[in-house]
């Protein structure tokens, strides 16, 4: 049976917590990704940004999980209007910002 949205969001948060906890060396060798507006469509926007990071095993599970939240197919190089224009940040900061936002969504009961 399908996982309830609240459980899926909690599992994604858990994975991001694991990443922040276990981060010793710079995450993904300090790779930079496009910053996004943390608004509607956050899952697809986050995936569109993170999918451009390759060869980083630490975020592969996150990429797969975000894929489950995003209703459309996302491929590298694609980007929606949710990108913050010409602003790139380190993956570690991106993950932290995303974690803060998702925890707030969970607290507010916004699971989809």
């Amino acid at each position: 049976s399908p996982v309830p949205p609240s459980t899926a969001l909690k599992e994604l948060i858990e994975e991001l917590v694991n990443i922040t906890q276990n981060q010793k060396a710079p995450l993904c060798n300090g790779s930079m990704v496009w910053s996004i507006n943390l608004t509607a469509g956050v899952y697809c926007a986050a995936l569109e940004s993170l999918i451009n990071v390759s060869g980083c095993s630490a975020i592969e599970k996150t990429q797969r999980m975000l894929n489950g939240f995003c209703p459309h197919k996302v491929s590298a190089g694609q980007f929606s209007s949710l990108r913050v224009r010409d602003t790139k940040i380190e993956v570690a900061q991106f993950v932290k910002d995303l974690l803060v936002h998702l925890k707030k969504l969970f607290r507010e009961g916004q699971f989809n």
């Epitope: 609240s6 909690k10 948060i13 858990e14 917590v17 922040t20 906890q21 943390l38 608004t39 932290k96 974690l99 803060v100 936002h101 925890k103 707030k104 969970f106 607290r107 009961g109 699971f111």
Partner: antibody, heavy 125, light 112 residues
């Protein structure tokens, strides 16, 4: 260290407005919710509303809806509570408080863990 | 709105006593995400409130182990296992599960 410093006491006339500020330090307000709670003399605590400074989303108690406006300025790490059409019953100490997430827990408390010192607003003709 | 009713409204006790304060909500306060955001705050005259307990039973950092919380659904308790002189104060329960969030009317704990 974490601190919330509120603006000073105010004396206001009935029908006027008051704007109380709450300056945060030691954390990023965009990572938090900022709340306002008031306490009339000799009375209990009353939650008024909250803001998510990351996006400006607010929630208010219906009895204050239309009279209260909570805002936050991320650039100055300051939250504000403005109350209009003041009446004598609004005489109270107004507190700001924050609730924040923690990097290392999945299920956060988001309870009001740090509070400002309080601002006494007196409404009198 | 959800009403939070505390009992007793005031209570006289001695140092070393075990004290229990109860809080009843007018309806179930389980959040849509499965958590119950029931908190307890302590307030001393002329001071801001202090967080003691969150999510029914989790003790906030720095809070002595003599403070404990329990309950479920609509009935909750704060227990102080052995009263200390600094514990004489007013205690408030609070629900943060359903907007508008609401406090109980308070329980004043006085020295006998």
């Amino acid at each position: 260290q974490v601190q919330l410093v509120q603006s000073g006491a105010e004396v206001k006339k009935p029908g006027s407005s008051v704007k109380v500020s709450c300056k945060a330090s030691g954390f990023y307000i965009k990572d938090t919710y900022m709340h306002w709670v008031r306490q009339a003399p000799g009375q209990g605590l009353e939650w008024m509303g909250t803001i998510d400074p990351a996006n400006g989303n607010t929630k208010y108690v219906p009895k204050f809806q239309g009279r209260v406006t909570i805002t936050a300025d991320e650039s100055t790490s300051t939250a504000y509570m403005e109350l209009s059409s003041l009446r004598s019953e609004d005489t109270a100490v107004y507190y700001c408080a924050r609730s924040i997430y923690d990097d290392y827990h999945v299920d956060d408390y988001y309870a009001m863990d740090y509070w400002g010192q309080g601002t006494l607003v007196t409404v009198s003709s | 709105d959800i009403q939070m009713t505390q009992s007793p409204s005031s209570l006289s006790a001695s140092v070393g006593d075990r004290v229990t304060i109860t809080c009843r909500s007018s309806q179930n306060i389980v959040h849509i995400n499965g958590n119950t955001y029931l908190e307890w705050y302590q307030q001393k005259p002329g001071k801001a409130p202090k967080l003691l307990i969150y999510k029914i039973s989790d003790r906030f950092s720095g809070v002595p182990s003599r403070f404990s919380g329990s309950g479920s659904g609509t009935d909750f308790t704060l227990t102080i296992s052995s009263l200390q002189p600094e514990d004489f104060a007013t205690y408030y329960c609070f629900q943060g599960s359903h907007v508008p969030w609401t406090f109980g009317q308070g329980t004043k704990l006085e020295i006998k």
